[in-house]
């Protein structure tokens, strides 16, 4: 049994780091493998993660941690029984993938303005809470070419757009994702999408 693709890990910078790797053949990850992780610190101890299958030869493990700070560095040991298959390290702050925003809502009752709001996925005492910026994706269900991205570079989790920038009388969907420049993170996954029917009063034309 050998590791074909070494573990790569990302952290949500809150409570979970996810490591993925591939073995050289079909593997029952949960029965055959264990991933041990330990913070490099005098009081810490090793914890065991039981991996799940992620495709035939792929494995994924969710490492639990109560919090993350920028200096944290973990040792990782991948075991198959008594055989050490791989040894490495992981610094969560250097491999951050933020949590996806939630509760995306489209408010359509604000005088021909669409107000999109969502929730910051972090609690106020988490470092990322005040460092997230967002991208909002809006698309038409009827017209695949009607697809747009709005970058929200301010901290408030909301976006206002004129309803008239979208076509009237058709349905749209929106979703939002987050990233944090301070840790040069990857983008989060997209939030679940929300749907609304776009309608607005056409401006009265005077001749």
């Amino acid at each position: 049994m050998k590791v074909l693709q070494e573990p790569t890990c990302v952290s949500d910078y809150m409570s979970i780091s996810t490591c993925e790797w591939k073995m050289n053949g079909p593997t029952n990850c949960s029965t055959e493998l264990r991933l041990l992780y330990q913070l490099v610190f005098l009081l810490s101890e090793a914890h065991t993660c039981i991996p799940e299958n992620n495709g035939g030869a792929g494995c994924v493990c969710h490492l639990l941690m109560d919090d993350v700070v920028s200096a944290d560095n973990y040792t990782l040991d991948l075991w198959a029984g008594q055989q050490l298959l791989w040894k490495g390290s992981f610094k969560p702050s250097e491999h951050v993938k933020p949590r996806a925003p939630g509760n995306l809502t489209v408010h359509t009752n604000v005088s021909d303005t669409l107000l999109l709001t969502w929730s910051n996925p972090y609690p106020p005492d988490n470092y990322l809470y005040n460092h997230l910026t967002y991208a909002v994706n809006i698309w038409s269900e009827n017209d695949p070419a009607d697809f747009r991205i709005y970058n929200v570079t301010y901290l408030e989790p909301s976006l206002r757009i004129a309803a008239s920038t979208l076509k009237s009388g058709i349905s749209y969907r929106a979703r939002v994702r987050a990233w944090a420049q301070c840790y040069n993170t990857t983008w989060s996954e997209w939030s679940p999408s929300t749907k609304w029917h776009n309608s607005y009063r056409e401006p009265f034309e005077q001749h």
Epitope: L42, A71, D72
Partner: antibody
Framework: EVKLAESGGGLVQPGGSLRLSCAAS????????MNWVRQAPGKGLEWVAN????????YYVDSVKGRFTISRDNAKNSLYLQLNSLIAEDTAVYYC???????????????WGQGTMVTVSS | DIQMTQSPSSVSASVGDRVTITCRAS??????LAWYQQKPGKAPKLLIY???SFQSGVPSRFSGSGSGTDFTLTISSLQPEDFATYFC?????????FGGGTTVEIK
């Protein structure tokens, strides 16, 4: 409410013994490293000892090694410090304190008791 | 043992002032440093852990920085309730050790 409450302090003669207790409430006591920290009158803070969640690891400052013993009873949510062969320099307020982290511990103390005074004097 | 040296030992300041306290370790401690505030007759209160991470509930005017041997606690705009003694503490190796303290007094 998360709380620690020390007891057992008092006046003791040099060479004497005391047993300090710390009652924990409002949190999962068995999940945290626990510490004793002392402060002599008008002086700074001095870490004395700590103990792992299950009691299997214990560490002490050199000046109390062989004289003080830290222990815990997770079933009673209690931390203890047995003080033997006391000397005048042990006179201090003794605080119990919780490590803020569980997974992982952080070596920083977020919950403190009100302290109990130990006076060693003849 | 790792010695922790705080400076200054005391500082006089006014409400609204920016106050900086430094802590130097006798050898490298990575980022394993905490800061505490203590008022007379009271137990210490944790402000910062791991050099720069905020303890929940601590006002944002307190911030910590540094790694290795040199660390700083900054109070961006001193408030009346901030007059107290501040201690740093290392957790890189046993025995855990505290700095001697810095007293912030009213000017």
């Amino acid at each position: 409410e998360v709380k620690l409450a020390e007891s057992g302090g008092g006046l003791v003669q040099p060479g004497g013994s005391l047993r300090l207790s710390c009652a924990a409430s409002g949190f999962t006591f068995s999940s945290h490293w626990m510490n004793w920290v002392r402060q002599a009158p008008g002086k700074g803070l001095e870490w004395v000892a700590n103990i792992k969640q299950d009691g299997s690891d214990k560490y002490y400052v050199d000046s109390v090694k062989g004289r003080f013993t830290i222990s815990r009873d997770n079933a009673k949510n209690s931390l203890y410090l047995q003080l033997n062969s006391l000397i005048a320099e042990d006179t201090a307020v003794y605080y119990c304190a919780r490590d803020r982290g569980v997974r992982p511990p952080r070596g920083a103390f977020d919950i403190w008791g009100q302290g109990t005074m130990v006076t060693v004097s003849s | 043992d790792i010695q922790m040296t705080q400076s200054p030992s005391s500082v006089s300041a006014s409400v609204g002032d920016r106050v900086t306290i430094t802590c130097r370790a006798s050898q490298g401690i990575s980022s394993w440093l905490a800061w505490y505030q203590q008022k007379p007759g009271k137990a210490p209160k944790l402000l910062i852990y791991a050099a720069s991470s905020f303890q929940s509930g601590v006002p944002s005017r307190f911030s910590g920085s540094g790694s290795g041997t040199d660390f700083t606690l900054t109070i961006s705009s001193l408030q009346p309730e901030d007059f107290a003694t501040y201690f740093c503490q290392q957790a890189n190796s046993f025995p855990l050790t505290f700095g001697g303290g810095t007293t912030v007094e009213i000017k």
